[in-house]
Amino acid sequence: TALSPAPTTMDFTPAPLEDTSSRPQFCKWPCECPPSPPRCPLGVSLITDGCECCKMCAQQLGDNCTEAAICDPHRGLYCDYSGDRPRYAIGVCAQVVGVGCVLDGVRYNNGQSFQPNCKYNCTCIDGAVGCTPLCLRVRPPRLWCPHPRRVSIPGHCCEQWVCEDDAKRPRKTAPRDTGAFDAVGEVEAWHRNCIAYTSPWSPCSTSCGLGVSTRISNVNAQCWPEQESRLCNLRPCDVDIHTLIKAGKKCLAVYQPEASMNFTLAGCISTRSYQPKYCGVCMDNRCCIPYKSKTIDVSFQCPDGLGFSRQVLWINACFCNLSCRNPNDIFADLESYPDFSEIAN
């Protein structure tokens, strides 16, 4: 064939707005506008059309769009023509999205959820991968089992605890303390037959620079578990925090630059400046992670005038602990995340 598509996820094809093969022209000059502008439904922007002629109600997410019927810029939408190449006449309004991700040599689209293995479910958000464990974390047995250890069982994905007794014969542990993930989720009455659950945020997917963390929550009308994401930046990659540790000290728990700054994402800049706190570093083998944090909403403005907002981790305080793994292993932290309820806030 004359065209060879690469073996990646195919772009969607828009529903036909009309037969564009016979009449591909959408803008007409001179402009022909109705005597009065249309009245738009609640929440739909009244904008100038793409021909820069008339007022129109902006097309919404999933609507067809053309050079004339443009997507709602106030909702961060753009016209995705990828289903109509090479004509680029009719597209579909899509969300302005960030960067795709590469994990273990595999490329994932922004927003795409995937399972790199049986233990984790991951999501690509603006260039960073965030994962949540699929194996329910059962606490190790206590008291009656002096030497618990986790072992892989053939045919099973998730490791299980076994108890090494005095006879050194491993046996499966009794099903005690098998209630939840490592960190306890918020449980409250939501509506009949629904117990609301929000998992803690997963660790940031990168040890420095922009990353993502995710959590599962069923606090919605359908009581259906959904994955939420937020951007995170534990510490800048381009600052050597080791040099800031005072003489005689082994750690710097929190690092805060003197100047305020704007966040940048996919070429877009935050609409206001911030003075964030970052987690520091230690001279020994300890690693510093947030233990008091919250989630803030950051609005971004793009060069073409479009805007969008993202949830972002805001660090208030960090602590340095001994449970450190390879910072480049995005799954390592998920194995042993500390049981601090503040992290989920």
Epitope: A6, S21, Q25, T66, Y88, G267
Partner: antibody
Amino acid sequence: EVQLVQSGADVKKPGASVKVSCQASGYTLTSYDIHWMRQAPGQGLEWMGWINPNSGNTGYAEKFQGRVAMTSHTSTSTVYMELSRLTSEDTAVYYCARGAMGGFDPWGQGTLVTVSS
Amino acid sequence: DIQMTQSPSSVSASVGDRVTITCRASQDISRWLAWYQQKPGKAPKLLIYAASTLQSGVPSRFSGSGSGTDFTLTISSLQPEDFATYYCQQANTFPITFGQGTRLEIK
């Protein structure tokens, strides 16, 4: 103003590879496909392929299949075209252009690639 | 692949003249044709898309017509800055193909 700015001229030896960059400004890179064309000295325009910077999907003209790779780096609003196993016949000005309704607009200023031993 | 054939390959004309360039596709491309102007050492510039729609900022002396397989680009009154090479391009199907070009020279 919507603009595409390409990297500077390059001289390569036969058998080598060349990587040309194309940086977009004035719009969100992920909203449009980028196409690559080339023009040999005194010759017409030849289409090479496209890339969707949002999905990473690509499509190449059969002539270049296996020898061309188009990639994108959305955080820097840059698209790249790499052509390998160069011969003297690959000496040309290489252009990137944004896919628009029924045509290409705008175009980059062009990058002259000279293949000479 | 769709072949695009332009005629003439070159034309000489004077300022103020009306000039017509034709482009023929080897198969039906509906109205999916674009016209470009290219000056020496410069990148092509989109003049007309969808056979007859004038690109924003292009002078109205340029016009396009046709559908199916036969298309024309007309410059109603040549200006000094119009002397250049003109290309047609089909945007109906992949692979995208261009005409070989028409060089417009000063008489």
